[in-house]
Structure formats: structure tokens, C-alpha cells
């Protein structure tokens, strides 16, 4: 017996052909002897089978000896045994019809699980492959399950559903919501205004939520909100601001806030979360603000960072062309009794610039 | 002899209405699915919309909720209803029979008549 | 969606050549496509269906043949009446598409 797997929700074509090529009376039935359609001359007609609307055949074929069975909009029920009868033989055809669905909806935040559900139809004992979007394989029985999604999970998942040898492809788009990047820091020397850019990791027609950011300064004892606000099909609109720092925020995605000036007391990390409608669990992105100062004071050159700095961070003072004259890692360095011209204070990760401040000291008469 | 005759065709302005009809002979009109099948001035055949013997019917992305395909059985006659026409549908638009249903192909078809749509 | 890529978009040939137009379909279309003629004016007469089954009154240097996603229109000898336009249609499901066509011309 032949046997042929067919999709939930997709076409299956069965096919039948008879020895003579040319159109001869045949008749499809199913295991009860239902009929479902047949011929009558050149004109299709259906038996009272629960196929009716749904089956259908090609009638171009027929002068060929072909006379193939459509059925259309699979559902798991559809698993049967089809019989074709045509020229006195009878030609029998397993169709094995399975479901592949998401339990949830395709839409997951990052961290949560994914679990995928196979239907399939009593007797049958098929085997699940799935593959991620990253290539990572999982197999399964009934249900696969994935827990903490990443973003590289975001894509087509693409399951084989393998039973009597033969097997069908389902093709599943998991989408999993997060921000671009779990961290950013920014470098900025004192009075520069301030950018904080938070891209999403995905696209979607609508998007309703509010979200929020909190801001541990490095100076203060405790995190404080620093703007609340909401998100309407991708519009953005500030429900509530600090008076310091008065907070700018743009009114398209990305979600963009502007600090109108970097200062001492606002360096720090912050949280963005992100609450969407009709998803349990948040959105994060963590923004770290590091703010440098040079001063000159008397005789004493003095270049300070504040904020979330590595421990492997640079900090130097140099005379702008030579050698540097201070290079420690701290979070500041002094020149006692500075020669007069262009100095550089240079935050650096192993060679490379992040920070930059230049100050020019006058000669002393 | 199978024969299909299509009218109603004309110049209409964006944004309006018109119904196509075809009528059709010397088959049995009932046993086949029928399409519509459109050509704008220097292009190619374009599928607009079908309908088969039990009266489903199957559109095209281009047209689907502004055009309408159905089928009169008693009077041998197939119909487009289209609105919310824009320049873009200006064409001649063909009926045709299929071989049989809707898995068939278009094996017959009229001379068609056309759709013009400007202000 | 299937598309239909058809080719070459036209074609000059002479009296008595054998010509090949081809149609790629972007999936499988399991051997279900026609093909059609249609002279200036005039609707589309089929000539061929289900890949190489000629339509009744069709001549028999037309010839078809393919699987999968490539097929071919062959004319063995070209004939004055077959400078026309010519298309593919896929009817492997109902959402039917057709090849941009291909004009042959006199050379």
C-alpha cells in the first residue's frame, strides 16, 4: 500500500492511472466505501463523503488514463485509506495527514521557551527534527521544546515529520523580541550632549507598549526613573520626565532619548525595559554612560572619568605629539606642574581610543 | 462550438464601478470552472480571478476585496464585478473556460473587451 | 506564490528553424504547466497542457516537455502562421500564474 503524507491546511494530490490511456469510468472511495468523486462521461460528480466541498480532481488528465484525487484545506481527520477503482483494480493509498503549530504564539520574548506540538493521527508514530534559524538541532516525539530563546532563534525553524520512511517539511517563522544588543556603553566628555539609541531586534506591523528607564548614577544611593513612557503603533509618547536630567525622547522608533548634557553626577548604567501588550515578561537594555573632565587647577592637570569603566581601561595625560606623561588604570590622573601646550586626556582600551578631552595649558611668566 | 462573449467593458473614472459579463455557448456551462484573465495595453496575461463548478472562487492579490467573480448557471453567464478601479486595471480583460475545474487549464477563451480607467 | 520567469522575452527566427522557449517556475510545479499562442487582437488558444499533452487541432511540431521547475516550448519547423506571442501558465494550484511571454518575430 502506498503511503503519502499530507500537511495540516495544505493540498494533497493523490494519484491513480489505469493501464488504457483514455478517460474510463473510475471512482475514488475511502476506507468505509464512501464514495468521494468519480466520473460520469467527461463530468466530474462527488459522493455524500464529509470530502464533498474539498475534493476535486483534474479532468485534463482523464484522456490519459490519470484521474487523480485533490483534496484540498488537510485536516489531521483526513487520514485514511483512499481506494481508487478503475478497469476492475482497485488502488489503495495511505494518506497520513500531521500538524505541526507553535503552542504560543510565534512571537516570544527573549529568554522564554518555544514548545512546538505535532498532530498527527491515531496509530502513527512519527519522529520531529527541527532545525534553527543558527542551525542548532532538536528532535522529538510529540513536542519539542526550547527553552531561552536567543535572538539568533529569530527565523525560519524548519521541522521533518518522518514516518514509514517518507517524511514532510513544515516551516515555522518564530520571531523573538529583543533589543538589537543586551548592552551599550557611551564615551563622552563633560557638556557634550548625549545620545542613547535602543533598536529593536525585529519588525512588526504594530507595535503598543510602555516602557521605562531607570538610571543608577554612580554618585547616587539608589536608581531613580528617569523617563516613563508609551508606545502606540510604533509612536512614542513621554508620559514622565525628571526635572534633572530633563530627558529628550524621539517620537519614532528607535527608541531614542537624548541627554542634553554629559555630566559628572549623571554617569552611571541604566535600564530601558520595554513592556509590549499582550506579552507576559519585559523587553531589557542596559545603556552605561561614561563622562570625562580635564581641569586645570594652580599647577595640578587633572583628567577624571566617571561611570562603568573596566578595570583593563587606560587612562593618560599626555603633551599633545610626545609620550604619555601619566598612564594608569584608574579613574584619574594628574600632572603636577604642566608644561604649556595642548594636552590629551586619552581613556584607551588595549591601544584603542574611546575618550578623548583636550585642554591647553598657558605658559606661566 | 464553445463560445464565450464578453461586454460591458468602457471608460471609467478612478474610484468607479463596472461589471463585466460573459456569456457563454455550446457547452455545458454548469460542469466548468470559468476565470477571468486580464492584459494591459503591451503586457502580458495576467489571472484575475476564478470560480468553479461549485461556485468557489480564488482571486489574485492585485484584486482580491475589490473585485468580485461569480456565476449565473441558469443563464449561461459569468460576471465581474469590479470596483475601486485604478489606472492600473486599465486592460483587456479575457474570460475563459477551464479543461474542467479549478487543477485545470484555461482551454477556451473570448476576444475579450476593454477596461479603461482614467480621469 | 509561484512565479514564472519565461524565456527569452522574444525571439527572431525564420521560416523552417526549430525554436525553444523555456519557463522556470520558483518551486515545483509537478509537471502542470500549458502553454498558450495569441496573435495581435485575438485571445490565447492553448496548445499544450500537463507539460507535452498536445490540445486537440493542435500540429504536431509543437512539443512540450520538462519536470520540477524547468520546461520547454519547442517548435520543430516554424510555420508563417506561428510568429505570434507565446506564454506559460502554471495550474499546479488554482492561484494561477503566467511566464512574461515571448514574442517571435521574422527574422
Known amino acids: 500500500k502506498k503511503v503519502v503524507l499530507g500537511k495540516k491546511g495544505d493540498t494533497v494530490e493523490l494519484t491513480c492511472t489505469a493501464s488504457q490511456k483514455k478517460s474510463i469510468q473510475f471512482h475514488w472511495k475511502n476506507s468505509n466505501q464512501i464514495k468521494i468523486l468519480g466520473n460520469q462521461g467527461s463530468f466530474l460528480t462527488k459522493g455524500p463523503s464529509k470530502l464533498n466541498d474539498r475534493a476535486d480532481s483534474r479532468r485534463s488528465l482523464w484522456d490519459q488514463g490519470n484521474f487523480p484525487l485533490i483534496i484540498k484545506n488537510l485536516k489531521i481527520e483526513d487520514s485514511d485509506t483512499y481506494i481508487c477503482e478503475v478497469e476492475d483494480q482497485k488502488e489503495e493509498v495511505q494518506l497520513l495527514v500531521f500538524g505541526l503549530t507553535a503552542n504560543s504564539d510565534t512571537h516570544l520574548l527573549q529568554g522564554q521557551s518555544l514548545t512546538l506540538t505535532l498532530e498527527s493521527p491515531p496509530g502513527s508514530s512519527p519522529s520531529v527534527q527541527c532545525r534553527s534559524p543558527r542551525g542548532k538541532n532538536i528532535q522529538g516525539g510529540k513536542t519539542l521544546s526550547v527553552s531561552q530563546l536567543e535572538l539568533q532563534d529569530s527565523g525560519t525553524w524548519t521541522c521533518t515529520v518522518l514516518q514509514n520512511q517518507k517524511k514532510v517539511e513544515f516551516k515555522i517563522d518564530i520571531v523573538v523580541l529583543a533589543f538589537q544588543k543586551a548592552s551599550s556603553i557611551v564615551y563622552k566628555k563633560e557638556g557634550e550632549q548625549v545620545e542613547f539609541s535602543f533598536p529593536l531586534a525585529f519588525t512588526v506591523e504594530k507595535l503598543t507598549g510602555s516602557g521605562e528607564l531607570w538610571w543608577q548614577a554612580e554618585r547616587a544611593s539608589s536608581s531613580k526613573s528617569w523617563i516613563t513612557f508609551d508606545l502606540k503603533n510604533k509612536e512614542v509618547s513621554v508620559k514622565r520626565v525628571t526635572q534633572d536630567p530633563k530627558l529628550q525622547m524621539g517620537k519614532k522608533l528607535p527608541l531614542h532619548l537624548t541627554l542634553p548634557q554629559a555630566l559628572p553626577q549623571y554617569a552611571g548604567s541604566g535600564n530601558l525595559t520595554l513592556a509590549l501588550e499582550a506579552k507576559t515578561g519585559k523587553l531589557h537594555q542596559e545603556v552605561n554612560l561614561v563622562v570625562m573632565r580635564a581641569t586645570q587647577l594652580q599647577k595640578n592637570l587633572t583628567c577624571e572619568v566617571w561611570g562603568p569603566t573596566s578595570p583593563k581601561l587606560m587612562l593618560s595625560l599626555k603633551l599633545e605629539n610626545k609620550e604619555a606623561k601619566v598612564s594608569k588604570r584608574e579613574k584619574a590622573v594628574w600632572v603636577l606642574n604642566p608644561e604649556a601646550g595642548m594636552w590629551q586626556c586619552l581613556l584607551s582600551d588595549s591601544g584603542q581610543v574611546l575618550l578623548e578631552s583636550n585642554i591647553k595649558v598657558l605658559p606661566t611668566w | 462550438e464553445v463560445q464565450l462573449l464578453e461586454s460591458g467593458g468602457g471608460l471609467v473614472q478612478p474610484g468607479g464601478s463596472l461589471r463585466l459579463s460573459c456569456a457563454a455557448s455550446?457547452?455545458?456551462?454548469?460542469?466548468?470552472?470559468m476565470s477571468w484573465v486580464r492584459q494591459a495595453p503591451g503586457k502580458g496575461l495576467e489571472w484575475v480571478a476564478s470560480?468553479?463548478?461549485?461556485?468557489?472562487?480564488f482571486y489574485a492579490d492585485s484584486v482580491k476585496s475589490r473585485f468580485t467573480i461569480s456565476r449565473d448557471n441558469s443563464k449561461n453567464t459569468l460576471y465581474l464585478e469590479m470596483n475601486s478601479l485604478r489606472a492600473e486595471d486599465t486592460a483587456v480583460f479575457y474570460c475563459?473556460?477551464?479543461?474542467?475545474?479549478?487543477?485545470?487549464?484555461?482551454?477556451?477563451w473570448g476576444q475579450g473587451t476593454t477596461v479603461t480607467v482614467s480621469s | 506564490d509561484i512565479q514564472m520567469t519565461q524565456s527569452p522575452s522574444s525571439l527572431s527566427a525564420s521560416v523552417g528553424d526549430r525554436v525553444t522557449i523555456t519557463c522556470r517556475a520558483s518551486?515545483?510545479?509537478?509537471?502542470?504547466i500549458a502553454w498558450y499562442q495569441q496573435k495581435p487582437g485575438k485571445g490565447p488558444k492553448l496548445l499544450i497542457h500537463?507539460?507535452?499533452t498536445l490540445h486537440p487541432g493542435v500540429p504536431s511540431r509543437f512539443s512540450g516537455s520538462g519536470s520540477g521547475t524547468d520546461y520547454t516550448l519547442t517548435i520543430s519547423s516554424l510555420q508563417p502562421e506561428d510568429f505570434a506571442t507565446y506564454y506559460c501558465?502554471?495550474?499546479?494550484?488554482?492561484?494561477?500564474?503566467f511566464g512574461q511571454g515571448t514574442k517571435l518575430e521574422i527574422k
Open positions: 475563459s473556460r477551464h479543461y474542467g475545474g479549478s487543477y485545470d487549464p484555461m482551454d477556451y
Open positions: 455550446g457547452f455545458s456551462f454548469s460542469n466548468y470552472a
Open positions: 470560480i468553479n463548478e461549485g461556485g468557489s472562487t
Open positions: 518551486q515545483d510545479i509537478n509537471k502542470y
Open positions: 500537463y507539460t507535452s
Open positions: 501558465l502554471q495550474y499546479d494550484n488554482p492561484l494561477y500564474t
